[in-house]
Every structure is written in structure tokens, then in C-alpha cells.
Interface confidence: medium
Amino acid sequence: MMTGTIETTGNISAEKGGSIILQCHLSSTTAQVTQVNWEQQDQLLAICNADLGWHISPSFKDRVAPGPGLGLTLQSLTVNDTGEYFCIYHTYPDGTYTGRIFLEVLESSVAEHGARFQIP
């Protein structure tokens, strides 16, 4: 039975050219996290594997940095980065948990940032 829940940064916005941290946190389960996938719509951005560590997709290696923690840092943002991002936690024995984040990249310099997410 899957008892865990995913907390995310939710809906966030950032300025074009800036950077943003995407964070998810899995709680309320004792399942072991074996891998976390970060995906944007249908594209795989990065993977953090418990055995092998971080792997960044070659298509994004210039603009994506691992961490902090199991989060992901997006750099040099463009308006094309606007959209849904998913953190997919592969766990044993529970199975898969998915969290959703919506990022809006704004042209304006008055982009309103969401509250900074803290891992408890």
C-alpha cells in the first residue's frame, strides 16, 4: 500500500535569463528511494540513481545542474522553459510517486517568485 506523499514547490515563476530550483520531497513512507527522474512534459531532464548518482540528459547539460539534494537547478531560463515539470520517485517496495511543478518564465524583471522551498 502506498502511503507516501510528494510535496513540491508548486507553481513558481522566474525571470528570463535567471535560474530556479525545482524541489520535491517524499514523506510519510519508509520506502527506499531507488531513483528520481526529472521530466519536462515528455522529455527526460535528469536522473538521480541511488547507486550511480546523477545523470543529466545531454540535451540539457549546459543548463541543468543537479541538486540541491534530489532537486534540480535550471539555469539561463528562456520563455520556452515555461511548462510542467515532474519529479518521479521510484521507490521500493511502494512503487512510483509523481510530483508536479508548473514553472512560468517571465520576460519582465518583476517576476514574482514562489516561496523558497525547504526540505524538512
Partner: nanobody, 125 residues
Framework: EVQLVESGGGLVQPGGSLRLSCAAS????????MGWFRQAPGKEREGVSA???????TYSDSVKGRFTISRDNSNQILYLQMNSLRAEDTAVYYC???????????????????WGQGTLVTVSS
């Protein structure tokens, strides 16, 4: 940290067979896919075969029907059974590991960041 150690290479005559093994150690969960690559003298490293999520397998055109990849999950050992060997199969063979996901099961080395030291296979009469 995962470490990969290949064995089973050697000298074999054309038409002969060899079985390569790759033992993984230092893992916590074993949640990754694995592949075999090779590098012939003076050539670039190329993908040979991989075993991916759900036990799916893939092979390069040059070895399809001659080589068989398999994996012993309980002992974290990867195998490559090589039959009908040819002179052009001569190379150093490497095993590699990458994260497991449900995307394409291909032989791109981009996602393989953990490599063994290699084992030499020489096919000659």
C-alpha cells in the same frame, strides 16, 4: 560506488565462442540497466548490446543473431554469450551501467557513466 569488473576474454578462433561476464559490486539497490560496448584498435567505442527495463534487450546490427545478453539479477552479474566469432569482433569489451527508466532501450553511451576496465577478445586463427 558501483564498480564493474569484466572477465572471460581471451583468444579464440574464427567461428568459436566466448562468454563474457561483468560483476557489479558496491551497489545498494541494483536499480540500473547494463550494456556491453567494445573498442577495436584505432576505432571509436561502439555499443554492442544492452539489457534495459523490463528485461528488454537490444543489439547492434553487427552482432544480432550471434551474441546474447543476459543478467543474473540476484548476483548482479551481466553476461554476453558470443557465438560465431569473426576477426572483426576483436576488441576490448567493456560493460557499463546506467540509470533504469522506461524510455528508449538504445546503445547510446551518453547515459553510461559507470564503466568497467575492459577485457580483451582476440579472434584469430
Amino acid at each position: 560506488e558501483v564498480q564493474l569488473v569484466e572477465s572471460g576474454g581471451g583468444l579464440v578462433q574464427p567461428g568459436g565462442s566466448l562468454r563474457l561476464s561483468c560483476a557489479a559490486s558496491g551497489y545498494k539497490y541494483g536499480v540500473y540497466s547494463m550494456g556491453w560496448f567494445r573498442q577495436a584498435p584505432g576505432k571509436e567505442r561502439e555499443g554492442v548490446s544492452a539489457i534495459c527495463s523490463g528485461g528488454r534487450t537490444t543489439y547492434s546490427d553487427s552482432v544480432k543473431g550471434r551474441f546474447t545478453i543476459s543478467r543474473d539479477n540476484s548476483n548482479q552479474i551481466l553476461y554476453l554469450q558470443m557465438n560465431s566469432l569473426r576477426a572483426e569482433d576483436t576488441a576490448v569489451y567493456y560493460c557499463a551501467a546506467r540509470p533504469l527508466w522506461t524510455g528508449d532501450c538504445d546503445l547510446s553511451s551518453s547515459w553510461y557513466k559507470t564503466w568497467g576496465q575492459g577485457t580483451l577478445v582476440t579472434v584469430s586463427s
